[in-house]
């Protein structure tokens, strides 16, 4: 039985060429966490293996840095940046927990932080 | 020298599921620190990388067919399988599976089973 | 999904020719891209990975060149073995995807 939540950032707003952390907590489980891929509608950015560490897509590596801890760091934001992101933790015994973030990456400077929620 | 070996049937019916297991001997999928892939080539046609597995179990899939595969991992018996569901025709292909170098780049898909021809007809 | 074009569909050539064979992406993959060596009834074979590096026990004839968007296979002087079909790989962003394809055939 899946018990484990996914506690995310939200939805996060940052702007223009600046940089943002993409941020997935999993808790109420005591699964060992084997894997998290990071993804961005149909592309994958980056996997952090429990065994192998952290490999990021060649596509991404200029704008893509690994953590802080299971994280993402997002840099040089473009608008094009703009949409959802999810976070896969592969876990066992439990099996898969995915949390939802939604970037939206703005012209102006002022770029506020949503609130966090969670992912049952 | 290691070597896979691809299982499974041969034909399978429009909307059922498709289960292939691959056999691999000549090493440890648990201590080799690879992923473990399946890649398919409709007959005539190129090649298209379906999903790869750790022996953990983590996986990561091509999104075109995310919604259908599920690929698992049993050390120990060294296999891996895959199954694709609500197949049609446009599955029937040669199924390969062959170990994945996603942390080791040079490797690419340096080692391949021989290939097993599924057919999906009523 | 970066998509990988092979020119020509077909080489007809003679042993002891030189074969050039071109793969062309969609939009950049740096350097990540390989090329697969396939004979009838036989899985792919890798040839060369990141764009000009021989895999293991691979004969010199073979080499890789190019980066960006345009890539060359050459066979410096085809062995009869080397008549088989060609895919350059892309690995730059996910999904990997092939190329359709090159078919070198005796002429």
């Known amino acids: 039985m899946m018990t484990g939540t996914i506690e995310t950032t939200g939805n996060i707003s940052a702007e223009k060429g600046g940089s943002i952390i993409l941020q997935c907590h999993l808790s109420s489980t005591t699964a060992q966490v084997t894997q998290v891929n990071w993804e961005q509608q149909d592309q994958l950015l980056a996997i952090c293996n429990a065994d192998l560490g952290w490999h990021i897509s060649p596509s991404f590596k200029d704008r893509v840095a690994p953590g802080p801890g299971l994280g993402l760091t997002l840099q040089s934001l473009t608008v094009n940046d703009t949409g959802e992101y999810f976070c896969i933790y592969h876990t066992y015994p439990d099996g898969t927990y995915t949390g939802r973030i939604f970037l939206e990456v703005l012209e102006s400077s002022v770029a506020e932080h949503g609130a966090r929620f969670q992912i049952p | 020298q290691l070597q896979l070996q691809e299982s499974g049937p041969g034909l399978v019916k429009p909307s059922e599921t498709l289960s292939l297991t691959c056999t691999v001997s000549?090493?440890?999928?648990?201590?080799?620190?690879?992923?473990w892939g399946w890649i398919r080539q409709p007959p005539g046609k190129g090649l298209e990388w379906i999903g790869s597995?750790?022996?953990?179990?983590?996986?990561y899939y091509n999104p075109s067919l995310k919604s259908r595969v599920t690929i698992s991992v049993d050390t120990s018996k060294n296999q891996f399988s895959l199954k694709l569901s609500s197949v049609t025709a446009a599955d029937t292909a040669v199924y390969y599976c062959?170990?994945?170098?996603?942390?080791?780049?040079?490797?690419?898909?340096?080692?391949w089973g021989q290939g097993t021809l599924v057919t999906v007809s009523s | 999904e970066i998509v990988l074009t092979q020119s020509p569909a077909t080489l007809s050539l003679s042993p002891g020719e030189r074969a050039t064979l071109s793969c062309r992406a969609s939009q950049s993959v740096s350097s990540y891209l390989a090329w697969y060596q396939q004979k009838p009834g036989q899985a792919p074979r890798l040839l060369i990975y990141d764009a000009s590096n021989r895999a293991t026990g691979i004969p010199a004839r073979f080499s890789g060149s190019g980066s960006g968007t345009d890539f060359t296979l050459t066979i410096s002087s085809l062995e009869p073995e080397d008549f088989a079909v060609y895919y350059c790989?892309?690995?730059?962003?996910?999904?990997?995807?092939f190329g359709g394809g090159t078919k070198v055939e005796i002429k």
């Open positions: 062959a170990r994945d170098g996603l942390y080791h780049t040079p490797e690419y898909f340096q080692h």
């Open positions: 790989q892309q690995r730059f962003a996910h999904p990997y995807t």
């Open positions: 597995i750790y022996y953990s179990g983590s996986t």
């Open positions: 000549g090493g440890s999928i648990s201590s080799s620190r690879y992923y």
